[in-house]
């Protein structure tokens, strides 16, 4: 039985060209990571975060995504394309996965307000 | 190479208790949960439960809850089942095995310690 | 709690032979399953994982197939140092569960 809540940064938004963090956390389970997978709105995988292995950032990405902080994922030089929807799947042991959904607009505002709160999607 | 190695077999009496070590080599021991395995004499496999090697919380199965308790001891990639209260019925091989696979449609069972035989007699 | 059960518990066969070993689940169980090898007196070692795929030095006679609530271990040409016990496991979430196992004996 699925005991565990993904928490996650929920809607937010960020200014183009700047950056922004992108954190899930699981809770509420005795279940033990094992692997945090992040996906674009596309299904194309960002990054990997193995317990083994550590991190692995995509090429595509590599120059605009940098890990952390903890199981997250910092986009950095913002453009327009990447407002969307974005994932954190969670491999955990003996659970199962448990999946996050984080929706980022980019603004073209330099006005644009970053909020990042926490809430269970 | 990656390796369980277990303590060795044990002769209790009843109402005794006994202490399995399994240590671990070979790879990052807090990366992969660890699991407890019985297998009674004549009899098949019985998963008794696991140990969460991050933040050492175990789990115990319905009927290995009580009197077995799963820890370890990260300074020396060891994890540990201890079953007091020793019964006759106890008497069994026990297993330690690491979950393998980083994904969940991958996880198995992947490497074993060579078991430690626990022989409960008056 | 999802159950396995293994058929048959007894399989007598000749070596050469080839053989199948089937372990259906209570529920669906999507392809969290593995196979599992033990000869008398040591320790299971993996020869199957996600169903259908071949661990790491395991010899290709083996396969696995299947997926939801039906499962198969075939051994295409049975060697000698076949003739031992073989398990099913599920790894669906909480409580992982072995089947009863399957003792493969010369004929």
């Known amino acids: 039985m699925m005991t565990g809540t993904i928490e996650t940064t929920g809607n937010i938004s960020a200014k183009k060209g700047g950056s922004v963090i992108l954190q899930c956390h699981l809770s509420s389970t005795m279940a033990q990571v094992t692997q945090v997978n992040w996906e674009q709105h596309d299904h194309s995988l960002l990054a990997i975060r193995n317990a083994e292995l550590g991190w692995h950032i995509y090429p595509a990405f590599k120059d605009r995504v940098a890990p952390g902080p903890g199981l997250g994922l910092t986009l950095q030089s913002l453009t327009m394309n990447d407002t969307g929807e974005y994932f954190c799947t969670y491999h955990t042991y003996p659970d199962g996965t448990y999946r996050g959904r984080i929706f980022l607009e980019v603004l073209e505002s330099s006005v644009a307000e970053h909020s990042a709160r926490f809430q269970i999607p | 190479e990656v390796q369980l190695v277990q303590s060795g077999s044990d002769l209790k009496k009843p109402g005794a208790s006994v202490r399995v070590s399994c240590k671990a080599s070979g790879y990052t021991f807090t990366s992969y949960p660890m699991n407890w395995v019985r297998q009674a004499p004549g009899h098949g496999l019985e998963w008794m439960g696991w140990i969460n090697t991050n933040t050492g919380n175990p789990t115990y199965v319905q009927g290995f809850t009580g009197r077995f308790v799963f820890s370890l001891d990260t300074s020396v990639n060891t994890a540990y089942l201890q079953i007091s209260s020793l019964k006759a019925e106890d008497t069994a091989v026990y297993f330690c095995?690491?979950?393998?696979?980083?994904?969940?449609?991958?996880?198995?069972?992947?490497?074993w310690g060579q078991g430690t035989m626990v022989t409960v007699s008056s | 709690d999802i159950q396995l059960t293994q058929s048959p518990t007894f399989l007598s066969a000749s070596v050469g032979d080839r053989v199948t070993i089937t372990c259906r689940a209570s529920q669906v169980i999507s392809s969290s399953l593995a196979w599992y090898q033990q000869n008398p007196g040591k320790a299971p070692k993996l020869l199957i994982y996600a169903a259908s795929t071949l661990q790491s030095g395991v010899p290709s006679r083996f396969s696995g197939s299947g997926s939801g609530t039906e499962f198969t271990l075939t051994i295409s040409s049975l060697q000698p140092e076949d003739f031992v016990t073989y398990y099913c496991q599920h790894l669906h979430g909480y409580p992982s569960n072995f089947g009863q196992g399957t003792k493969v004996e010369i004929k």
């Open positions: 095995a690491r979950t393998g696979g980083h994904t969940y449609d991958s996880y198995a069972f992947d490497v």
